[in-house]
Interface confidence: low
Amino acid sequence: DTEIKVNPPQDFEIVDPGYLGYLYLQWQPPLSLDHFKECTVEYELKYRNIGSETWKTIITKNLHYKDGFDLNKGIEAKIHTLLPWQCTNGSEVQSSWAETTYWISPQGIPETKVQDMDCVYYNWQYLLCSWKPGIGVLLDTNYNLFYWYEGLDHALQCVDYIKADGQNIGCRFPYLEASDYKDFYICVNGSSENKPIRSSYFTFQLQNIVKPLPPVYLTFTRESSCEIKLKWSIPLGPIPARCFDYEIEIREDDTTLVTATVENETYTLKTTNETRQLCFVVRSKVNIYCSDDGIWSEWSDKQCWEGEDLSKKTLLR
């Protein structure tokens, strides 16, 4: 009984289309597949950033696969051919592995790359990224930001830089159509007459870096002799009400400090008739139903009631 063997895929390579970390892994069918014309050959692909402990594993019938990587590090991948048991009258047959690697040869020492990169998607509308120049780089060093997400034909350069002392230290992005819930890739590279500058790569999803506007129109209403309802309005913009969490900070007579996190635009507070002063502020954040992470808004303006019977007055009017 001759042992059934199959070759690994041919021409296995990692191709960089210039999307700042979104790479193509592609290959060709193995040689000598003639014996298995009636079979659908499958491929098991494993890949990771060099240094990562775990491989991502994909089984596919296609001759290509696409995914995002951290280009600050190298990438390694391996692939082999799988013949399912239906083709071999028994157990599955695997080829040996074909392996490949990819990395961008780094220019400049790590200290020349941008420091403290910080990106915030304000109110789910306006993306702003800022950074500090690398350690010890000269004033002739300038940084350029490029970005890409699925839907763009090619990587785009920032057209509205924030500058300090003639250097680019940030970018105000234009309207980014259909850019959330997918990886957003950024490269900040640099140029200097004196020394090569190391590029930096960043990947995130915009819905996870949203900083909403603070809530507005805070009001008080006396619900009963011992209950006061605090109300506020969601800030304007594209974020739906169901996506907000709120944190409230309440001071009573300058002594107690109550903090609470709520999902709705109201909060009922137990109080005493002796309460002479009540102040509260609210801030908002995108909740777990709409993102994996987020940034708290600034606190709202403080709203206070003081020295008047709350039962007779609804505040802010």
């Epitope: 509308q125 507005v216 129109y217 304007l236 913009g237 594209p238 303006d301 403080k302 206070c304």
Partner: antibody, heavy 119, light 111 residues
């Protein structure tokens, strides 16, 4: 609670100037814009302009650009409007009104100051 | 400048009536998915009071019988059940472009 208290009524002669004040309390003055609105007796409302109480940035209705000057004094949380070269059609009630941002409306108004231009 | 045209200029109604006031802008007042349209109520000798902002959002402390709708150029203020304190003049106002402009007003009188 939020309060905008405006200065008292003024009677001025044609060609003269007047400076109206609007003292804010009960909120963080520098977080808001202050708008000024004109209303002639029995007429509608006319927006004069606004000033960012934090940065001092101003936006004017071109109709008033050369004659209205908006300023703020952050230390006293007071907004001012100076109207120059007054004429009879400037006889009106002038309101200050705070605004959080373009889409949020002018949510609190002063009680108004009546300016009468008469010789 | 964006022109704002309100209709009717006045109307007579009874307590409990449903009242509708319309406002048309000479060009769209929408931007960023928001309608920059506000509605104010003014009583004689008093300052205007914000009822509705961003076309449909209620100003704080305002009764729920006031509602706003519309987008682009055509907007409506509705009072679902007119109350005695609602007899006043109502103004629409756009805040999309400087100079901000108001409608000429709609006076709601007792029938």
């Amino acid at each position: 609670q939020v309060q905008l208290v405006q200065s008292g009524a003024e009677v001025v002669k044609p060609g003269a100037s007047v400076k109206l004040s609007c003292k804010a309390s009960g909120y963080t003055f520098t977080n808001y814009w202050m708008n000024w609105v004109k209303q002639r007796p029995g007429q509608g409302l006319e927006w004069i302009g606004r000033i960012d109480a934090y940065a001092g940035e101003t936006h004017y209705n071109q109709k008033f650009k050369d004659r209205a000057i908006l300023t703020v004094d952050k230390s006293t949380s007071t907004a001012y409007m100076e109207l120059r070269s007054l004429r009879s059609e400037d006889t009106a009630v002038y309101y200050c009104a705070r605004g959080y941002g373009d889409a949020y409306g002018m949510d609190h108004w002063g009680q108004g100051t009546l300016v009468t231009v008469s010789s | 400048d964006i022109q704002m045209t309100q209709s009717p200029s006045s109307l007579s109604a009874s307590v409990g009536d449903r009242v509708t006031i319309t406002c048309r802008a000479s060009e769209s007042v929408d931007n960023y998915g928001i309608s920059f349209m506000n509605w104010f109520q003014q009583k004689p000798g008093k300052a205007p009071k914000l009822l509705i902002y961003a076309a449909s959002r209620q100003g704080s402390g305002d009764p729920s019988r006031f509602s706003g709708s519309g987008s682009g150029t055509d907007f409506t203020l509705t009072i679902s059940s007119l109350q005695p304190e609602d007899f006043a003049t109502y103004f629409c106002q756009q805040s999309k472009e400087v100079p901000w402009t108001f409608g000429q007003g709609t006076k709601v009188e007792i029938k």
